[in-house]
Amino acid sequence: KESCDVQLYIKRQSEHSILAGDPFELECPVKYCANRPHVTWCKLNGTTCVKLEDRQTSWKEEKNISFFILHFEPVLPNDNGSYRCSANFQSNLIESHSTTLYVTDVKSASERPSKDEMASRPWLLYRHHHHHHHHHH
């Protein structure tokens, strides 16, 4: 039942917790059969997704999958937010689910939240400690 539809393997509710100042590669896993589609990244601003025109991107080709990579060198605090990749293939536009980057500013990370803060703002625990796996290749 192998289909030749282009697939973008970004899962709904996927997240990455990253540190400002570090390099980071945001991967869009792409499956295609013959001709590689044109893939772009955009960043969500409300309901619109703003295309990232002048950012460094690259392709990494593996046996059964390719990765369109958005490079963060380094990660900046305002890189926090949700991103989506899109593929143009035979005049069809295929959009991925959004993936969210939670950027922790190194300065604020060193000033660790107190236990009281953690108790009153449980989402802090989530953002600081809920690190999702990167894709295994």
């Epitope: 039942k1 289909s3 539809d5 697939q7 973008l8 393997y9 899962k11 709904r12 509710q13 996927s14 896993p29 499956k31 059964n64 999958i65 989506r84 536009l93 295929i94 959009e95 991925s96 689910h97 959004s98 999702h132 796996h133 894709h135 295994h136």
Partner: antibody
Framework: QITLKESGPTLVKPTQTLTLTCTFS??????????VSWIRQPPGKALEWLAH???????RFNPSLKSRLTITKDTSKNQVVLTMTNMDPVDTATYYC?????????????WGQGTLVTVSS | DVVMTQSPLSLPVTLGQPASISCKST???????????LNWLQQRPGQSPRSLIY???KLDSGVPDRFSGSGSGTDFTLKISRVEAEDVGVYYC?????????FGQGTKVEIK
Amino acid sequence: QITLKESGPTLVKPTQTLTLTCTFSGFSLSTFGMGVSWIRQPPGKALEWLAHIYWDDDKRFNPSLKSRLTITKDTSKNQVVLTMTNMDPVDTATYYCAHGNWDGETYFDYWGQGTLVTVSS
Amino acid sequence: DVVMTQSPLSLPVTLGQPASISCKSTQSLLDSDGKTYLNWLQQRPGQSPRSLIYLVSKLDSGVPDRFSGSGSGTDFTLKISRVEAEDVGVYYCWQGTHFPWTFGQGTKVEIK
């Protein structure tokens, strides 16, 4: 050809932990897009999705049962294991594992035969 | 959670005649990626479920083309153009747009 088969106890006592194994063939759970879900069906009732594990070991749970569930995979053995703690008679159901295919998101294209689990003292 | 409501719950049909099942959701199933993750399953008596249709209208492999799916947003329909004896069973719609994934209560198709 994709096949899945559930195995585990047919009878568990209230408060005990249920461990079910899904053994599959015809696909690899390390391939992008692949996943396995557990779904249950109480006798004569509708289906209820419990948990899903993705190709990269990412997991999703039904929030109503999340505190009681764990799901793990062993790619080398082609197995997915579901554990459910603190079993209650209302958890009596046929438990299915299903292959999650991907077309922008998961859908279940192959199902196991199911295993009936009765919770009774 | 998104509640999926099917109607009718019981559908007596005549062999060779068409049949139609409705499925309604409490939230739109149109995802932000532009796709609608509404699927249909068939469960024959004493068997495990089988995938019929995914993404509203895509027939899964091996499914006869007398089955078709349609709809958008919150209203969806499964149609059987000419019912055959092997179509007897319970049909479920389910949604994969919102977590947790949820199923309808099922529609039992039986021959008159």
